[in-house]
């Protein structure tokens, strides 16, 4: 709390300008009118105020707007945004994408801070859903943004927004998140032809069920091993050797290098050894010839 003192003669600020950097904290408090500051917030960004001086300016705005700043002020906060706490931001009502962009720009190049996370949360909740323009903006600033959302939050993403998603945006997504995103992607890209469809859907396949993988195996897609290794184990297990061979195409040779890792390891354990031998890769661990394979999941379904 800055002590209230009278403004020295001749120092009353008539505008927010560069001369204010030479004011002491108490002079800023006494000589800068809060309403003047609010209307000229855009100028603050061009002035090299110290953090202590920014604290005073923030304090003045807090006094002027105890219920939260109006968007006209928020949009021009610039690096004063870095002084805001999540509690401050929760009082805001940010509806303009331009305001969001302006504040994300201030934090650009840094990790997502609690302030930014709160800002995004307020913005998305205000909009009701994560529309394409918002998603475009957020993933441009934070490629990992999508994967920071819970499956519940992801369920509010409309399929049309999926077009904004780049492969790198999904790098840190876990299977539960991809389970939510995959059906949306499938819907979004449904009118594309085979090869184009595969290029777009590839990043989302960690959420694909067995039947979709079987369908893809009929389309000469030549899935790379990196994508195959990210598939759900439970979706890969029912695939036959022939289906996996078709799915991977020339990349099938890569299975040898991955035979000790999931899902390849678990898939090998489910295949007949003589079927695996047809690949000529020396994969070991399949079911020996003459053994009966009981599909317990089918047994349960029938009983």
């Amino acid at each position: 709390e800055v002590e209230k003192t009278a403004c020295p003669s001749g120092k009353k600020a008539r505008e927010i300008d560069e001369s204010l950097i030479f004011y002491k904290k108490w002079e800023l408090e006494a000589c800068v009118d809060a309403a003047l500051l609010a209307t000229q917030m855009d100028r603050v960004n061009a002035i090299p105020f110290t953090y202590e001086q920014l604290d005073v300016l923030k304090h003045k705005l807090d006094e002027l707007y105890p219920q939260g700043y109006p968007e006209s002020v928020i949009q021009h906060l610039g690096y004063l945004f870095l002084k805001m706490s999540p509690e401050d931001i929760r009082k805001w009502n940010v509806t303009s994408l331009e305001t969001l962009k302006a504040l994300l720009e201030v934090n650009k190049g840094h990790e997502m801070s609690p302030q930014v996370a709160t800002l995004i949360d307020r913005f998305v909740k205000g909009r009701g859903q994560l529309d394409k323009d918002t998603l475009d903006t957020l993933t441009a600033f934070y490629p990992g943004y999508l994967c920071s959302l819970s499956p519940e939050e992801l369920s509010s993403v409309p399929p049309s927004s999926i077009w904004a998603v780049r492969p790198q945006d999904l790098d840190t997504c876990d299977p539960r998140q991809l389970d939510v995103l995959y059906p949306k992607a499938r819907l979004a890209f449904q009118n594309m032809n085979g090869s184009e469809y595969f290029v777009k859907i590839q990043s989302f396949l960690g959420g694909a069920p067995t039947e979709d993988l079987k369908a893809l195996s009929q389309q000469n897609v030549s899935m790379d091993l990196a994508t195959f290794m990210k598939l759900r184990t439970d979706a890969v297990l029912p695939l036959t050797v022939a289906e996996v061979q078709k799915l991977l195409g020339p990349h099938v040779e890569g299975l040898k290098a991955e035979e000790r890792h999931r899902p390849v390891r678990d898939w090998i354990l489910r295949q007949r050894q003589d079927d695996l031998d047809t690949l000529g890769l020396g994969l070991q661990g399949g079911i020996p010839n003459g053994y009966l394979v009981l599909d317990l999941s089918m047994q349960e379904a029938l009983s």
Partner: nanobody, 114 residues
Framework: QVQLVESGGGLVQAGGSLRLSCAAS???????MSWYRQAPGKQREPVAV???????SYADSVKGRFTISRDNAKNTVYLQMNSLKPEDTAIYTC?????????WGQGTQVTVSS
């Protein structure tokens, strides 16, 4: 990687002049350029500032003696220091705000002997 390179510091007699310069490279749209100084055992203080609009402002202690200017084409800011006094002895550091982000130079030593 933004770089600010200062030059022009040195040893000068009281009443003499020096011209400091600070060149910014790999930088975006510059909003303001300023000079700060820190004397031994004291806090860093602003000396002069020039904005993108060309308006300038000075600390009371240097008014009438120091002049700040900038060359936009070269992304360079200058500080012409005349009538130097021993109390102007300090490390002078340039500060630039570009695309709403602040950057500091390494500093250049100015020593004024009596």
């Amino acid at each position: 990687q933004v770089q600010l390179v200062e030059s022009g510091g040195g040893l000068v007699q009281a009443g003499g002049s020096l011209r400091l310069s600070c060149a910014a490279s790999a930088i975006g749209s510059i909003n303001s350029m300023s000079w700060y100084r820190q004397a031994p055992g004291k806090q860093r203080e602003p000396v002069a500032v020039i904005t993108d609009r060309g308006s300038t402002s000075y600390a009371d202690s240097v008014k009438g003696r120091f002049t700040i200017s900038r060359d936009n084409a070269k992304n360079t800011v200058y500080l012409q220091m005349n009538s130097l006094k021993p109390e102007d002895t300090a490390i002078y550091t340039c500060h630039v705000i570009a695309d709403w982000r602040g950057y500091w130079g390494q500093g250049t030593q100015v020593t004024v002997s009596s």
